[in-house]
């Protein structure tokens, strides 16, 4: 079901997203609850994802996400990543919320989630260069697979934004 043209104020702040797509959740109590993502965002588990078609630097991509009350994608599970991959175009690369600001290979997620080397999805030869301090998801043809690659943060790429579902 769709819950459109939501124009109300939430805690005295204008919602950035005026059109939401919501699904009804069965609640233990009698009241109805809605779980929503902004229109044109993808829904998976408890999050909403926006896949950009415009290219920008890593920093500008993160700002664009913030303007939508979201942040660059933080990958927490293989399932989440696989869902994202299904919605990406193989010929493009997409910034995610992982960076190495000092070039010391100390990777940081934008939401402060601890970086865990044992649950990473680097392409086999990556990360390749400490001067490349931002991470993209890209598709490699040999072997054919999606994975992570470190790239120059200033080079424009597409991106994936993530936000928690909105509950009404």
């Amino acid at each position: 079901q769709k819950y459109s043209q939501l124009l109300e104020k939430k805690t005295t702040k204008e919602l950035v997203h005026t059109t939401l797509e919501c699904v009804k959740k069965n609640m233990p109590v009698e009241e109805t609850a809605w779980s929503c993502c902004p229109k044109n965002w993808k829904s998976f588990s408890s999050n909403c994802y926006f896949i950009s078609t415009e290219s920008a630097s890593w920093q500008d991509s993160e700002k664009d996400c913030a303007r939508m009350e979201a942040h660059l994608l933080v990958i927490n599970t293989q399932e989440e990543q696989d869902f994202i991959f299904q919605n990406l175009q193989e010929e493009s690369a997409y910034f995610v919320g992982l960076s190495d600001p000092e070039g010391q290979r100390h990777w940081q997620w934008v939401d402060q989630t601890p970086y865990n080397e044992s649950s990473t999805f680097w392409h086999p030869r990556e990360p390749s260069d400490p001067n490349e301090r931002c991470v993209v998801l890209n598709f490699r043809k040999s072997p054919k697979r999606w994975g992570w690659n470190d790239v120059n943060c200033l080079g424009p790429q597409r991106s994936v934004c993530e936000m928690m579902k909105i509950h009404l």
Epitope: G103, Q104, R105, R125, P127, S128, D129, P130, K141, S142
Partner: antibody, heavy 117, light 107 residues
Framework: QVQLQQSGAELMKPGASVKISCKAT????????IEWVKQRPGHGLEWIGE????????NDNEKFKGKATFTADTSSKKAYMQLSSLTSEDSAVYYC??????????WGQGTLVTVSA | ETTVTQSPASLSMAIGEKVTIRCVTS??????VNWYQQKPGEPPKLLIS???TLRPGVPSRFSSSGYGTDFVFTIENMLSEDVADYYC?????????FGGGTKLEIK
């Protein structure tokens, strides 16, 4: 400037193991992959494997699986390659190199390993 | 595994001549090929890195070209100091693989 200093030549008995070291200076050791390459006369150059010291991640050439093991100690800025169950086929010069991008940009001077009864 | 076929295995050229060495890979590796020079008793020296990029300090008489599976390394106006073994390395796929080498001598 970037330098890689390898341990000295080794004369080993068949069946023994040897551990070669590669001391890195002039850069942030933990941030760059260290490569290991084998060279035998008439056999050219062969890539054995690599390690990213900061994370301990390794990639190896299937051909050397079970033969070569890679480790690194970030405190001493040393990378190590251990070769086990040595045979005459393992007699070679072994190089460590530092990868930059996808190029082996800086090389150690080489360590000669001779396996002889 | 990506195999690399390097030719010729040896080459005898006169000073001032143009030297051409070719490497062909068994799979498409974009432009992830590196070219090395090795002199006796020394480690290989990187001359050209991926993307046909001449390394800093390497004379401009050295160059390379190619993309996909076919790669060419060129020395314009060979000098006596260029006598050495030359190797290509494909770094596009794991495992990294070297060409068999080319021994360059003076005619």
């Amino acid at each position: 400037q970037v330098q890689l200093q390898q341990s000295g030549a080794e004369l080993m008995k068949p069946g023994a193991s040897v551990k070669i070291s590669c001391k890195a200076t002039g850069y942030t050791f933990s941030s760059y992959w260290i490569e290991w390459v084998k060279q035998r006369p008439g056999h050219g150059l062969e890539w054995i494997g690599e390690i990213l010291p900061g994370s301990g991640r390794t990639n190896d050439n299937e051909k050397f699986k079970g033969k070569a093991t890679f480790t690194a100690d970030t405190s001493s800025k040393k990378a190590y390659m251990q070769l086990s169950s040595l045979t005459s086929e393992d007699s070679a010069v072994y190089y460590c190199a530092r990868r930059g991008g996808y190029s082996f940009a800086y090389w150690g001077q080489g360590t000669l390993v001779t396996v002889s009864a | 595994e990506t195999t690399v076929t390097q030719s010729p295995a040896s080459l005898s050229m006169a000073i001032g001549e143009k030297v051409t060495i070719r490497c062909v890979t068994s799979t498409d590796i974009d432009d992830d090929v590196n070219w090395y020079q090795q002199k006796p008793g020394e480690p290989p020296k990187l001359l050209i890195s991926e993307g046909n990029t001449l390394r800093p300090g390497v004379p401009s008489r050295f160059s390379s070209s190619g993309y996909g599976t076919d790669f060419v390394f060129t020395i314009e106006n060979m000098l006596s100091e260029d006598v050495a073994d030359y190797y290509c390395l494909q770094s596009g796929n794991l495992p990294y693989t070297f060409g068999g080498g080319t021994k360059l001598e003076i005619k």
